[in-house]
Interface confidence: medium
């Protein structure tokens, strides 16, 4: 399986909400001994590999933001903790999973990573991740709504 990031860059005005999205692609093993652990974290574009370093998002760790289920089942994080920080991560039945960040500030700018770990409980882990950049802008040059740039090209889309 693979993880696709529909958008590689999100440019948003301060105070706006944004939903960062990843998609789980390919065949998904639904065996009883397979678990999919999905989560989000901040990172940096490391010299060795992007997304290798896991930093908290608004003080919430990858463990706090994880989604647990088998295959393409829907799930969401512990609401109370995340929502106190203006965050919510969720997934649907089609392999899409996302994190919504509310009331963006300049401090939210940076690289965000979604991580999927396929855990075969008596053998190994297989992990894949996707990376996307969030730029929060303020002032006269800031867009009125979030603008997203697809990963495959630099055509932008306005989202409200």
């Amino acid at each position: 399986f693979k993880v696709a990031t529909p958008y590689s860059l999100y440019v948003c005005p301060e105070g706006q909400n944004v939903t960062l999205t990843c998609r789980l692609l390919g065949p998904v093993d639904k065996g009883h001994d397979v678990t999919f652990y999905k989560t989000w974290y901040r990172s940096s574009r490391g010299e060795v590999q992007t997304c290798s370093e896991a930093r908290p998002i608004r003080n919430l760790t990858a463990a706090d933001l994880h989604l647990h289920h088998g295959g393409h089942q829907a799930a969401n994080t512990s609401h109370d903790l995340a929502q106190r920080h203006g965050l919510e991560s969720a997934s649907d039945h089609h392999g899409n999973f996302s994190i919504t960040m509310r009331n963006l500030t300049l401090l939210d700018s940076g690289l965000y990573c979604c991580l999927v770990v396929e855990i075969r409980h008596h053998h190994s882990e297989h992990r894949v991740h996707g990376a996307m950049e969030l730029q929060v802008q303020t002032g006269k040059d800031a867009p009125s709504n979030c603008v997203v740039y697809p990963s495959s090209s630099q055509d932008s889309e306005n989202i409200t």
Partner: antibody, heavy 117, light 107 residues
Framework: QVQLQESGPGLVKPSETLSLTCTVS????????WSWIRQPPGKGLEWIGY???????NYNPSLKSRVTISVDTSKSQFSLKLSSVTAADTAVYYC???????????WGQGTMVIVSS | EIVLTQSPATLSLSPGERATLSCRAS??????LAWYQQKPGQAPRLLIY???NRATGIPARFSGSGSGTDFTLTISSLEPEDFAVYYC?????????FGGGTKVEIK
């Protein structure tokens, strides 16, 4: 910050079952995988096995026939049972938390278990 | 089972010196390798995960490198509190395994 505390008898007789409990505080038991790791006196570390809050388990094959790890989400606890113990099972037993794909980032302080008659 | 071999078994150095610890895997673990520090009577403490990433709160004098089968933990300038036993651990396959440890002692 998540904290872990092991508890259980410090002395177990040969052929009996060693039972330990790890209590999780300061975080959700559903956020991590939970492992048991042991360290015989003066020796290195050995991973025993893990459990997830859903009940999924994975054990070290060298101990699998004797190990059971269980979880009680209502008490935020997970437990280790090791049957038919011998003197070779004398060790400090640690519980640890583990975010899949990363590493054991939080450990209990450890509890010494001596197997002796 | 993946076997991790650490060398040297003991490293005798003085404060301020550079320490270089090695961990070799019996088969490739990609970069799925962690390093821990353990002091007498204490639980291990995570230093490095994924071969080269420092865990939260770990000083910059600790650095990790390598991939595949050969890994190195470097302590650029030893502080008195760094004298301890260091373990590597792989998590690409189960069972999860640790190296036998390297003791860094005061010369």
């Amino acid at each position: 910050q998540v904290q872990l505390q092991e508890s259980g008898p410090g002395l177990v007789k040969p052929s009996e079952t060693l039972s330990l409990t790890c209590t999780v505080s300061g975080g959700s038991i559903s956020s991590y995988y939970w492992s048991w790791i042991r360290q015989p006196p003066g020796k290195g570390l050995e991973w025993i096995g893990y459990i997830y809050y859903s009940g999924s388990t994975n054990y070290n094959p060298s101990l699998k026939s004797r190990v059971t790890i269980s979880v009680d989400t209502s008490k935020s606890q997970f437990s280790l049972k090791l049957s038919s113990v011998t003197a070779a099972d004398t060790a400090v037993y640690y519980c640890a938390s583990d975010i899949p794909a990363f590493a054991f980032d939080i450990w209990g302080q450890g509890t010494m278990v001596i197997v002796s008659s | 089972e993946i076997v991790l071999t650490q060398s040297p078994a003991t490293l005798s150095l003085s404060p301020g010196e550079r320490a270089t610890l090695s961990c070799r895997a019996s088969q490739s673990v990609s970069y799925y390798l962690a390093w821990y520090q353990q002091k007498p009577g204490q639980a291990p403490r995570l230093l490095i995960y994924d071969a080269f990433n420092r865990a939260t709160g770990i000083p910059a004098r600790f650095s990790g490198s390598g991939s595949g089968t050969d890994f190195t933990l470097t302590i650029s300038s030893l502080e008195p509190e760094d004298f301890a036993v260091y373990y590597c651990q792989q998590r690409i396959n189960w069972p999860l395994t640790f190296g036998g440890g390297t003791k860094v002692e005061i010369k």
